[in-house]
């Protein structure tokens, strides 16, 4: 029922505007405007963006699983917005913590060539019947990511003249005929169709695909980042070592694979205030507008220190672009004088191919551990992950219709093959909450200082973080 | 439990001026409207002004432009300024606060006489 406000007596009107600053309380606000859409309703909840009728609505919205739900989150964003600071020493303990962890879980050089090992002696197997095959390191292993006990991945390049499934069902029979390898099986129905054994030495387990060309270049992208940044090797490990610990990187479990908590970092680095890495294509390159950044096609590294681009005219966006203009130009009257925007920009664009710095010239002088603190806050607080998409490639903050990808769960943009969602495995809503709330218990859990035998805390047991992030020392602080 | 307390209230000549005052002692929450109603002898218990926690004031016609509610959330205090007072202004003034959202008000004050003499 809709009230006449017109007809209410002052004494009523003062109990309806009571009852609405109640109801503000709980993010139930008095629409100025009502939405065209919904007449009868003279509300609206912020919470939950729902149009509500009138004040009975209201309350009975109040009650709903759904609003409770949000408002605990609410309130939860604002405690953790209003933890103090964290002092110097929390800070540098922070930092022994993490350099302590990335010693202790990532590979050593040791580690990293019996990895390379495995790859040459799977390389002598399958070249005695595949000649004109080669193998290659990729993944966490060349990027240095990898975890003591991270899968080896590794690539057969082959020409263009063998077909991909039968050259997988070759290296399958090879592989079972040979004595280096057992538990071999093929994962023929993942996203990038894989053989997978263990290596009868190491007991590592490897990961055989073919023509996986961009998961190659993404490699040599963040392997040069390591080498180049320092802080990025060991904050990928924290990283990688806590989803682990959170099991939300198993991708075959729907999880996210473990290179997007690299992208993830790297894309963190880039937002900060100030940027501690720089974006791979903006306005240093002659010509180019973000809103046309697929022109600019990123094509692996150069120097270590470089990423290489081109530019191609021929995109879709250009057509378009070109279609839009040419139905202008009929519209218009004749006039020499005139270029379009368009003409302009594709004069512009005279660079057609250049490369773009990996780092910025400024040394980096913020502690580890305040970055490992303001990764987790970043995307506990700062980034809406269901709202915009993770892109290393430019600055500006890319939102979902841009990529024209659903509103939900996490967007990871593969910086060489930008139509795909690398984080898509996750595509859960219950394990996407559940990756939100291991963000801000982490978060909660680093931000506040621990003591050395554990902080008492109220907080439900089952939510707390599960391990710390040395198993050697707990993080302490005075 | 809310303990209301009202003074200001006394003898005044038609034309003059009081100001009434309601201290609320006890567990006042935020978002709580405060108000004064008053009851003349032999007649009905009626609204005169009120104020909401966030500072929005609604007054009867009878006394509009000539009263003014005011609060001070700080002191849980709550004014009314009687201006330009007329013999039919002479009543019980109550204060009242709202708690439970349930009713409007639903603790009230003793009450402090207000007398205008013509």
């Known amino acids: 029922t809709v009230i006449d406000e017109s007809a209410l007596t002052p004494e009523q009107r003062l109990g309806l505007k009571q009852a609405e600053e109640r109801l503000e309380r709980d993010h139930i606000f008095r629409l100025e405007k009502r939405s065209p859409e919904y007449t009868n309703c003279r509300y609206l909840c912020k919470l939950c963006l729902i149009h509500i009728e009138n004040i009975q609505g209201a309350h009975k919205h109040i009650k709903e699983k759904r609003h409770k739900k949000n408002i605990l989150e609410k309130q939860e964003e604002s405690e953790l917005r209003s933890l103090p600071s964290p002092s110097s020493a929390h800070l540098a303990a922070l930092s022994v913590a993490v350099v302590e962890l990335a010693k202790e879980q990532g590979i050593t050089d040791d580690d990293l060539r019996i990895r390379q090992d495995i790859v040459e002696e799977m390389s002598k197997v399958i070249m005695t019947f595949l000649p004109e095959c080669s193998l290659r390191l990729y993944g966490s292993s060349l990027t240095k990511f990898a975890l003591k006990s991270s899968d080896v991945n590794i690539d057969i390049k082959f020409p263009p003249k063998m077909n991909h499934p039968d050259l997988l069902i070759q290296v399958l029979g090879i592989l079972k005929k040979s004595a280096l390898y057992i538990d071999v099986e093929s994962d023929f129905h993942a996203k990038v169709p894989v053989v997978v054994c263990k290596d009868r030495k190491s007991a590592l387990l490897c990961r055989v695909s073919a023509g996986n060309d961009m998961a190659c270049l993404t490699t040599d992208l963040l392997a040069a980042l390591g080498k180049v940044e320092p802080v990025f090797t060991p904050l990928v490990l924290a990283f990688r070592y806590w989803a682990k610990l959170c099991y939300i990187d198993s991708q075959t479990d729907g999880g996210i694979p473990s290179y997007c908590f690299a992208l993830m970092v790297m894309f963190f680095l880039q937002q900060r205030k100030p940027p501690l890495l720089p974006c791979l294509l903006g306005s240093w390159i002659e010509g180019f507008d973000p809103k046309r950044m697929d022109d600019f096609q990123l094509k692996g590294i150069v120097e270590e220190k470089f990423v290489k681009w081109e530019y191609n005219s021929s995109s879709a966006t250009e057509k378009n672009l070109i279609a839009d203009e040419n139905k202008a130009k009929a519209d218009e009257p004749k006039d020499d004088t005139k270029k379009t925007e368009t003409d302009n920009q594709s004069n512009a664009a005279k660079a057609k191919h250049g490369k773009s710095p990996l780092t910025l010239e400024a040394p980096n002088q913020v502690p580890l551990g305040q970055l490992w603190l303001e990764l987790l806050k970043f995307y506990t607080l700062d980034f809406a992950l269901e709202e915009y998409v993770i892109c290393v490639r430019i600055q500006d903050i890319l939102t979902r219709e841009n990529k024209n990808w659903p509103k939900r769960r996490i967007a990871i943009e593969d910086p060489f093959s930008v139509k795909r969602n690398v984080a898509r495995s996750l595509n859960s809503q219950l394990v996407y909450e559940y990756v939100v709330e291991r963000f801000r218990a982490a978060y909660r859990y680093f931000a506040c200082p621990q003591k050395k035998g554990g902080n008492k805390s109220t907080m439900d047991p089952k939510k707390k973080e599960k391990g710390k992030l040395s198993s050697k020392k707990p993080v302490k602080s005075d | 439990q809310v303990q209301l307390q009202e003074s200001g209230g006394g003898l005044v000549q038609a034309g003059g001026s009081l100001r009434l005052s309601c201290a609320a002692s006890g567990t006042i929450f935020q978002s709580t409207a405060m108000g004064w109603y008053r009851q003349a002898p032999g007649k009905e218990r009626e609204f005169v002004a009120g104020?909401?926690?966030?500072?929005?004031?609604y007054y009867a016609d009878s006394v509009k432009g000539r009263f003014t509610i005011s609060r001070d959330n700080a002191k849980n205090t709550v004014y009314l300024q009687m201006n330009s007072l007329k013999p039919e202004d002479t009543a019980v003034y109550y204060c009242?606060?709202?708690?439970?959202?349930?009713?409007?008000?639903?603790?009230w004050g003793q009450g402090t006489q207000v007398t205008v003499s013509s």
């Open positions: 009242a606060v709202s708690l439970s959202g349930v009713e409007l008000f639903d603790y």
């Open positions: 104020i909401t926690f966030g500072g929005s004031t």
